[in-house]
């Protein structure tokens, strides 16, 4: 009985030490944040500006309203605990897709016609920023005007219509080399992604004044690499499960391992009225112990540690992902600045 | 003599250990990078694609050329050793500037006239993306057409001309509330920044059909916050000296402290033809010992360590800044992807 009591006391003392340590860490982090903000804004001291002066100087105008309104909805890290931005996987920026064969696009002689594009799921779930169809026009012998048409195949209508227009343009071509021409197909691509069954393919025409088609749709001899293709630019903000990430704890947690703890910095609390917005923000901090292969920032860190003859100190609990905050503030010269301050929020803690 | 020989041997052994450790670290880092690339690209294995297939599939087209050309000039970290992007200080995005008084802008009775804008060096050295002059037009009682004129003061010319037009516009105002109107003044602002002596101020007129000026240039009672102001959007990529950063070493270095070491990853060397570009890149790695307050990532880390009752392990040598690489590759589905792979280059090492 005595033994278990002693054990309990030791445990309490351990928790108490952890609490005191976290308390110290919190205090240090707040002081450091104050120093950091002034230093990052290149201010020697906090601008001396009263609430009245702010009321007087602050334009009651749309651009200011917009900036301040961003802060009305406080960014809450835990709004969706299961998913967050994936800063590990590659972000796709451009996808170049070649045409493939399709049953819909057949000529009378059974040969495939150009062009059908299949889309990977990579495009499906991304916001298309730009989509260009690139076509190569064969060289001409004399100056000529070329009419380019990009047609979209549709299911034949009652009246027999099989096409609808995507884009058309007029080009003046001079003798010499062939040219690559790009055509904006963003809208049609977005429709295809929304309704994949509507993607039956496209037809490309580039007729000169005499009706000759200059577009390379199926490369002839010496025309390798001159196929039409789609260049799609996407913004890719993939999400991944928070399971892959560091631990999140709260102040009452008994977790001894490396963990992220909440910490809200309140500018009003320390009289920084010169910061117009936000009035407070979630900064967070890291605290806890690291074992060798626990929560390492880079997947290979444990390999390095395994091979580490001088690595006795081991990894340490540190922010592995930080994000900026946007701030609207007076700089003491009757100017209002809206800017981004890097690395002010701890998003994740890990051992590295 | 024997003592100094023993000492020399110990030192050699220490260096040898350090070499072996670094060799291990290098090897681990390369293996880890290979695993990372496949994992970050969500590929289970390296795509099996021959050089011939690549030659055939690769469009000989401008967008591909552009992407590949980026890699012809290999990014060399040491191209400018003294300056690099500043990821510490705040980046300014929007500056809102209020009018100040000026000697040039005086009315006959000696009262100041609106408007003179002083510009901080923050704008001087940044590229202006957008500059809007915002003016508030007092409410009208009946529907009216308003002619807005923004004039720029110039040094009086021989013929007495003191103004030149910046912008004029016609507005239809309905009874009710006053309105904020923005006017594009980017060109004139850029000129002022190039030749500050030409900035003598502006005059604002907003005359209704009866010749009444509706523009608030000096706020009357209840018109606080309705002053004209300039909203300037800038792109801000400040540089700071590399002195603030971590140490850089080479393979022959005897440095024992936390340091960044060079490491080039050569994709061709391990037969990864599916990566179109780059063929090789500088990955770098971190190695070395950490004292308590040496090279810490965040200015306040030492505060935290000072207060750390369980911090005996101390900080460790880890990447404190990593950057992505852009990669052009085949994904094995006849698609060429251009994307960004996060955290593949160690830019800086520090103790955190």
């Amino acid at each position: 009985n005595e033994g278990s009591e002693r054990e309990e006391n030791v445990e309490k003392e351990g928790l108490c030490n952890a609490c005191a340590w976290r308390q110290n860490t919190r205090y240090s982090r707040i002081e450091a944040i104050k120093i950091q903000i002034l230093s990052k804004l290149r201010l020697e001291t906090a601008p001396n500006i009263s609430k009245d002066a702010i009321r007087q100087l602050l334009p009651r105008a749309p651009p200011l309203r917009e900036l301040i309104d961003q802060y009305d909805v406080q960014r809450d890290d835990s709004s969706d605990g299961s998913l967050e931005d994936d800063d590990y996987h590659a972000t796709t920026e451009t996808i170049i897709t070649m045409p493939t064969e399709s049953d819909f696009l057949m000529q009378a002689d059974g040969k495939p016609k150009c062009c059908f594009f299949k889309f990977s799921s990579k495009i499906q779930y991304n916001k298309v920023v730009k989509a260009q169809l690139w076509i190569y026009l064969r060289p001409v012998k004399t100056p000529t005007t070329v009419f380019v048409q990009i047609l979209r195949l549709i299911k034949p209508m009652k009246d027999g219509t099989r096409y609808t227009g995507i884009r058309s343009l007029k080009l003046d071509m001079s003798p010499g080399t062939g040219i690559w021409q790009s055509i904006d197909v963003k809208t049609v691509l977005q429709n295809w992604l929304k309704q994949p069954e509507s993607n039956l393919g496209i037809e490309i025409k580039a007729l000169d004044e005499n009706g000759h088609d200059l577009a390379v749709t199926f490369p002839g001899p010496g025309e390798d690499g001159l196929n039409p293709f789609l260049e799609v630019k996407v913004t890719d903000t993939p999400k991944r499960s928070r399971r892959d990430f560091g631990l999140d704890c709260d102040e009452h947690s008994t977790e001894s391992r490396c963990c992220r703890y909440p910490l809200t910095v309140d500018f009003e609390a320390f009289g920084w009225d010169w910061i117009i917005a936000p009035k407070r923000y979630k900064a967070n901090y890291c605290s806890g112990e690291c074992e060798f292969v626990f929560l390492q920032k880079y997947p290979h860190t444990h390999l390095v540690h395994q091979a580490n003859p001088r690595g006795s100190a081991g990894p340490c609990c540190t922010p592995t992902k930080m994000s900026p905050i946007n701030m609207l503030y007076f700089n003491g010269k009757e100017q209002i600045i809206y800017g981004k301050i890097p690395a002010m929020v701890v998003d994740r803690c890990g051992c590295s | 003599n024997e003592g100094s020989e023993r000492e020399e041997n110990v030192e050699k052994e220490g260096l040898c250990n350090a070499c072996a450790w670094r060799q291990n670290t290098r090897y681990s880092r390369i293996e880890a990078i290979k695993i990372q690339i496949l994992s970050k690209l969500r590929l289970e294995t390296a795509p099996n694609i021959s050089k011939d297939a690549i030659r055939q599939l690769l469009p000989r087209a401008p967008p591909l050329r552009e992407l590949i050309d980026q890699y012809d000039v290999q990014r060399d970290d040491s191209s400018d050793g003294s300056l690099e992007d500043d990821d510490y200080h705040a980046t300014t995005e929007t500056i809102i500037t209020m009018p100040t008084e000026s000697d040039f802008l005086m009315q006959a009775d000696g009262k100041p006239k609106c408007c003179f804008f002083k510009f901080s060096s923050k704008i001087q050295y940044n590229k202006v993306v957008k500059a809007q002059l915002w003016i508030y037009l007092r409410p009208v009682k009946t529907p009216t057409t308003v002619f807005v004129q923004i004039l720029r003061l110039i040094k009086p010319m021989k013929d007495g001309t003191r103004y030149t037009g910046i912008r004029s516009l016609k507005l239809d105002m309905s009874p009710g509330t006053g309105i904020w109107q923005s006017i594009d003044v980017k060109t004139v602002l850029q000129n002022w920044l190039k030749q500050p002596e030409s900035n003598l101020g502006i005059e604002i007129k907003a005359l209704d059909e009866n010749g009444h000026d509706l523009a608030v240039t000096f706020p009357g009672p209840g018109e606080d916050g309705l002053n004209p102001f300039l909203e300037v959007k800038v792109t801000d990529t400040p540089k700071r000296s590399r002195r603030d950063f971590g140490l850089d070493c080479d393979e022959h270095s005897t440095e024992s402290r936390c340091c960044r070491y060079p490491l080039t990853v050569d994709f061709e060397a391990f037969g990864w033809d599916w990566i179109i570009a780059p063929k090789r890149y500088k990955a770098n790695y971190c190695s070395g010992e950490c004292e308590f307050v040496f090279l810490q990532k965040y200015p306040h880390t030492h505060l935290v360590h000072q207060a750390n009752p369980r911090g005996s392990a101390g900080p460790c040598c880890t990447p404190t800044k990593m950057s992505p690489i852009n990669m052009l590759y085949f994904n094995g589905k006849e698609q060429i992807i251009y994307g960004k792979i996060p955290a593949m280059v160690v830019d800086r090492c520090g103790c955190s």
Epitope: Q149, T161, Y163, G165, S168, L169, K205 | -
Partner: antibody
Framework: QVQLQESGPGLVKPSQTLSLTCTVS??????????WSWIRQPPGKGLEWIGY???????DYNPSLKSRVTMSVDTSKNQFSLKVNSVTAADTAVYYC????????????????????WGQGTTVTVSS | EIVMTQSPATLSLSPGERATLSCRAS??????LAWYQQKPGQAPRLLIY???NRATGIPARFSGSGSGTDFTLTISSLEPEDFAVYYC?????????FGGGTKVEIK
């Protein structure tokens, strides 16, 4: 409501130059996104496109007439004109000026090669 | 150049009947086809462009269809004012060409 009116001599001698003017009323030629065409119709026959001119002075001519045709725009007079050199009896026709259709949207630019407002036409006879 | 062939040359119908006019291109012109109506002593009037788009003010009884080389203009129920000559025009190439016309006359 935009209206077009052709004017010029009704009779031109062979080998001379045929000059026609089209006056635009009911709208300013310089503030519209349109291009302006000339079409002709020989007696009892179908229509033949001659060419068009836009505000920038850029022209497109029927290749069969290209060597003999010149078109221009005079925004100050709200007019555009046609000149055909070295005329022969084969150039006898009713000449129409027309406004190109303003394209539905930026997507299908080639629609501007159709004509949605026409003048009532002027007869030109080439004879000595 | 692209040759446009219209058929029939003459179509004799009564008011209220359905008229179907055909236009064939010597090669594919995609959807770059327009239809015009011309009455004696008058200038042509644009009816349809882009195969099936009605020009401003054109009644719904006029409709166009087709793509590639074969195109049709349909007048669902002939009104007295519809008796005229109808021309198709291709603009698939920069050398714009018209068909020879189809005359729709009262039977």
């Amino acid at each position: 409501q935009v209206q077009l009116q052709e004017s010029g001599p009704g009779l031109v001698k062979p080998s001379q130059t045929l000059s026609l003017t089209c006056t635009v009323s009911g709208g300013s030629i310089s503030s519209s996104p349109y291009s302006w065409s000339w079409i002709r119709q020989p007696p009892g026959k179908g229509l033949e496109w001659i060419g068009y001119v836009d505000l920038a002075g850029s022209t497109d001519y029927n290749p069969s007439l290209k060597s003999r045709v010149t078109m221009s725009v005079d925004t100050s007079k709200n007019q555009f004109s046609l000149k055909v050199n070295s005329v022969t009896a084969a150039d006898t026709a009713v000449y129409y000026c027309a406004r190109a259709l303003s394209s539905r949207s930026s997507e299908w630019l080639l629609d501007q090669y159709t004509m949605d407002v026409w003048g009532q036409g002027t007869t030109v006879t080439v004879s000595s | 150049e692209i040759v446009m062939t219209q058929s029939p040359a003459t179509l004799s119908l009564s008011p209220g009947e359905r008229a179907t006019l055909s236009c064939r291109a010597s090669q594919s012109i995609g959807i770059n086809l327009a239809w015009y109506q011309q009455k004696p002593g008058q200038a042509p009037r644009l009816l349809i462009y882009g195969v099936s788009n009605r020009a401003t003010g054109i009644p719904a009884r006029f409709s166009g269809s087709g793509s590639g080389t074969d195109f049709t203009l349909t007048i669902s129920s002939l009104e007295p004012e519809d008796f005229a000559v109808y021309y198709c025009q291709q603009y698939g190439t920069a050398r714009l060409t018209f068909g020879g016309g189809t005359k729709v006359e009262i039977k």
